[in-house]
């Protein structure tokens, strides 16, 4: 799998899970967020060549099309695949409120 | 939706449906399917700005990040959502085998 | 504790024109400040903001391009890149609510009185 | 992105009688909203934030409630001194939006 567990490790050029780390206010303008003051969202970045984590047939059809083709734009992409949500505190006047954010934070990645 | 029906009416940079014929012999090597000779696979492509289409909130956190980060190579892409499978006709020997091959054609696009 | 704006003017079609809002009795370092722009007889339309302790910038979708944002120790700055005669209006400048990490998202409890700007040719 | 629609344009009350405004945000705010007073020639003036907690100052004839994306704000036993035009916000996120203020209700007090 495309995951932190292989990627982070690795040093890798294809489609893998990168680290990125958000700071809700000054990377997002969402000032309601009391905590976390950011998070580790991650995101996929990579090549996407031929059977490289292929997600479906056609990603498998595109990356070998753009072996013979590599002209062509017409090639599969590196995006997310298994997300997972995140927990937020935020208050509404001085009552506390906690909030799951869903499909917040990437944990691996595929070609698409 | 970014299908063919407002993807090929529109001249669009963001995101959308590009028409793509596929000749399987001649683009992927394939010599045993006997029909069709070639497929309209389509792809998708374009750029993925904030709320263009977003697919999860993920996405939508990464393209507002984009906004504000426009050197980061963190972004979302434009890939594949809905897909049809494609019915091609081959033979073992003389006897011919119809067979649907699964998600091989691109219906509509995502920014993922 | 208040906000003036000064600068507004006549200008011309595509002449650039700077807007100063000058604060007195609190530091600008601790507090979120924000343009915001009312044309003659209709409603209040957001600009941008800047962040305080940040110093970061965000603008409003169409505004990106046609208004810069900046700050010293004791003004902030908006410039009006090429104004047209759609940014003929009123302009304000507003203080977050809350100092520090509160900022502006209990609103904006402080405004100047406004300065008024007029394109024509 | 969080647009903020505001309704109505514009309401007639008499003195003493109690008037509604609404807000509704094209999605989820999680009660970052805030309403302002406005009267001809002046600055705006904040008058509730959080969605339902009065600013300093504020009589208590003035209410906000609401949560998600509904939001209202009620005026109980007007005075003259409330004809003005009301503009909800929201304070949510400056990232990625238009405009934060709804479009403003104008409130004629007979």
């Known amino acids: 799998a495309l995951d932190a567990a292989y990627c982070f490790r690795n040093v890798q050029d294809n489609c893998c899970l990168r680290p990125l780390y958000i700071d809700f206010k000054r990377d997002l303008g969402w000032k309601w967020i009391h905590e976390p003051k950011g998070y580790n969202a991650n995101f996929c970045a990579g090549a996407c060549p031929y059977l490289w984590s292929s997600d479906t047939q056609h990603s498998r059809v595109l990356s070998l099309y753009n072996t013979i083709n590599p002209e062509a734009s017409a090639s599969p992409c590196c995006v997310s695949q298994d997300l997972e949500p995140l927990t937020i505190l935020y208050y509404i006047g001085k009552t506390p409120k906690i909030e799951q954010l869903s499909n917040m934070i990437v944990k691996s990645c595929k070609c698409s | 939706a970014l299908d063919a029906a407002y993807c090929f009416r529109n001249v669009q940079d963001n995101c959308c449906l590009r028409p793509l014929y596929i000749d399987f012999k001649r683009d992927l090597g394939w010599k045993w399917i006997h029909e069709p000779k070639g497929y309209n696979a389509n792809f998708c492509a374009g750029a993925c700005p904030y709320l263009w289409s977003s697919d999860t909130q993920h996405s939508r956190v990464l393209s507002l990040y984009n906004t504000i980060n426009p050197e980061a190579s963190a972004s979302p892409c434009c890939v594949s959502q809905d897909l049809e499978p494609l019915t091609i006709l081959y033979y073992i020997g003389k006897t011919p085998k119809i067979e649907q091959l699964s998600n091989m054609i691109v219906k509509s696009c995502k920014c993922s | 504790q208040s906000l003036e704006e000064s600068g507004g003017r006549l200008v011309t079609p595509g002449t650039p024109l700077t807007l100063t809002c000058t604060a007195s009795?609190?530091?600008?370092?601790?507090?979120?400040m924000s343009w915001v722009r009312q044309a003659p007889g209709k409603g209040l339309e957001w600009i941008g903001i800047i962040y305080g302790g940040s110093g970061s910038t965000w603008y409003a979708s169409w505004a990106k391009g046609r208004f810069t944002m900046s700050k010293t120790s004791t003004t902030v700055d908006l410039k009006i890149t090429s104004p047209t005669t759609e940014d003929m209006a009123t302009y304000f400048c507003a203080r977050g609510r809350d100092g520090g990490a509160g900022g502006s998202r209990n609103g904006y409890s402080l405004w100047g009185q406004g300065t008024l700007v007029t394109v024509s040719s | 992105a969080y647009d903020m629609t505001q309704t109505p344009a514009s309401v007639e009350v008499a003195v003493g009688g109690t008037v509604t405004i609404k807000c509704q945000a094209s999605e989820s705010i999680y009660s970052g909203l805030a309403w302002y007073q406005q009267t001809p020639g002046q600055r705006p003036k904040l008058l509730i934030y959080a969605a339902s907690d009065l600013a300093s100052g504020v009589p208590s004839r003035f209410k906000g409630s609401g949560s998600g994306t509904e939001y209202t704000l009620t005026i109980s036993g007007v005075e003259c001194a409330d004809a003005a035009t009301y503009y909800c916000q929201q304070t949510w996120t400056d990232g990625g939006i238009d405009n934060p203020f709804g479009g403003g209700t104008e409130v004629v007090v007979k």
């Open positions: 009795g609190f530091s600008l370092s601790s507090y979120d």
